[in-house]
């Protein structure tokens, strides 16, 4: 049985041109994390591999930075960056845990961070 839970930064908003940190945290499991994939819809943004470290997809190299930790920093945000982001934890022996973050990129300066929430 998969006992772990993923806590994410939840629904967040940020200003166009700014940057944002996407964070997930896996807890309540003894499973060992071997890789974390970051995806936007069906597009792979980055991989953090337990042995090989970070790999950023070439098409996102200019605007995506690894970290902090297993998180991901998106820079030079555009309105087109609005949408769902997923952190996918590959763990032994539990399997995969997936966390969801919704990012809204706003034109104005009224962007505020949403509350944290948990996905079991």
């Amino acid at each position: 049985m998969m006992t772990g839970t993923i806590e994410t930064t939840g629904n967040i908003s940020a200003e166009k041109g700014g940057s944002i940190i996407l964070q997930c945290h896996l807890s309540s499991t003894t499973a060992q994390v071997t890789q974390v994939n970051w995806e936007q819809q069906d597009q792979l943004l980055a991989i953090c591999n337990a042995d090989l470290g970070w790999h950023i997809s070439p098409s996102f190299k200019d605007r995506v930075a690894p970290g902090p930790g297993l998180g991901l920093t998106l820079q030079s945000l555009t309105v087109n960056d609005t949408g769902e982001y997923f952190c996918i934890y590959h763990t032994y022996p539990d399997g995969t845990y997936t966390g969801r973050i919704f990012l809204e990129v706003l034109e104005s300066s009224v962007a505020e961070h949403g509350a944290r929430f948990q996905i079991p």
Partner: antibody
Framework: QVQLVQSGSELKKPGASVKVSCKAS????????MNWVRQAPGQGLEWMGW????????TYAQGFTGRFVFSLDTSVSTAYLQISSLKAEDTAVYYC???????????????WGQGTTVTVSS | DIRLTQSPSFLSASVGDRVTITCRAS??????LAWYQQKPGKAPKLLIY???TLQSGVPSRFSGSGSGTEFTLTISSLQPEDFATYYC????????FGGGTKVEIK
């Protein structure tokens, strides 16, 4: 090259303890989970459990709780299996086995130690 | 817990024969199955993972197929060095092995 080298054969009396070592080389020890597998004489493979090489947290399969202890010394890239209060039925070959692959579909025991024979006899 | 049942337990075959071994899981395990070869006095060796992916260095006469609950290991043309015991294994949740199939010389 990537390998796991286990300690040598042991002959023990019932009630004694034994500690089997499994030294890893050729890879980053803390990046890959480590498992222990038992094979009794003439029998098949039996999964004993595993240890998280990042945290040192052990997980034991049913039938391997109490007398069996998994531990690590990451400074020398070594995993250990200790069995206490040995019984005749503990006579077996004990293997350490690394979980290879980084994504779930790829997981498998890709590297195995050569095995350590533990014989329990009075 | 997931149980793996292998058949047959014993198999007699000749060099050049095509050999098929079956592994059934007590519940669906997607493609999370591996096959191992073990020779007497030696440690098991990984042949195939993810049901059908050949491990590096393993001869192409070995192949795997299946998904869900039924899997097969096929040796297209048995060679003298292939006489051994073969195990299926799964490593999700509670890892387990099948009972083994001993491939003997006919």
């Amino acid at each position: 090259q990537v390998q796991l080298v286990q300690s040598g054969s042991e002959l023990k009396k019932p009630g004694a303890s034994v500690k089997v070592s499994c030294k890893a080389s050729g890879y980053t020890f803390t990046s890959y989970p480590m498992n222990w597998v038992r094979q009794a004489p003439g029998q098949g493979l039996e999964w004993m459990g595993w240890i998280n090489t990042n945290t040192g947290n052990p997980t034991y399969a049913q039938g391997f709780t109490g007398r069996f202890v998994f531990s690590l010394d990451t400074s020398v890239s070594t995993a250990y299996l200790q069995i206490s209060s040995l019984k005749a039925e503990d006579t077996a070959v004990y293997y350490c086995a690394r979980v290879g692959g980084f994504t779930v579909p790829e997981y498998a025991f890709d590297i195995w130690g050569q095995g350590t024979t533990v014989t329990v006899s009075s | 817990d997931i149980r793996l049942t292998q058949s047959p337990s014993f198999l007699s075959a000749s060099v050049g024969d095509r050999v098929t071994i079956t592994c059934r899981a007590s519940q669906g395990i997607s493609s999370y199955l591996a096959w191992y070869q073990q020779k007497p006095g030696k440690a098991p060796k990984l042949l195939i993972y993810a049901a059908s992916t050949l491990q590096s260095g393993v001869p192409s006469r070995f192949s795997g197929s299946g998904s869900g609950t039924e899997f097969t290991l096929t040796i297209s043309s048995l060679q003298p060095e292939d006489f051994a015991t073969y195990y299926c294994g799964q490593v999700m949740r509670y890892p387990a092995f099948g009972g083994g199939t001993k491939v003997e010389i006919k």
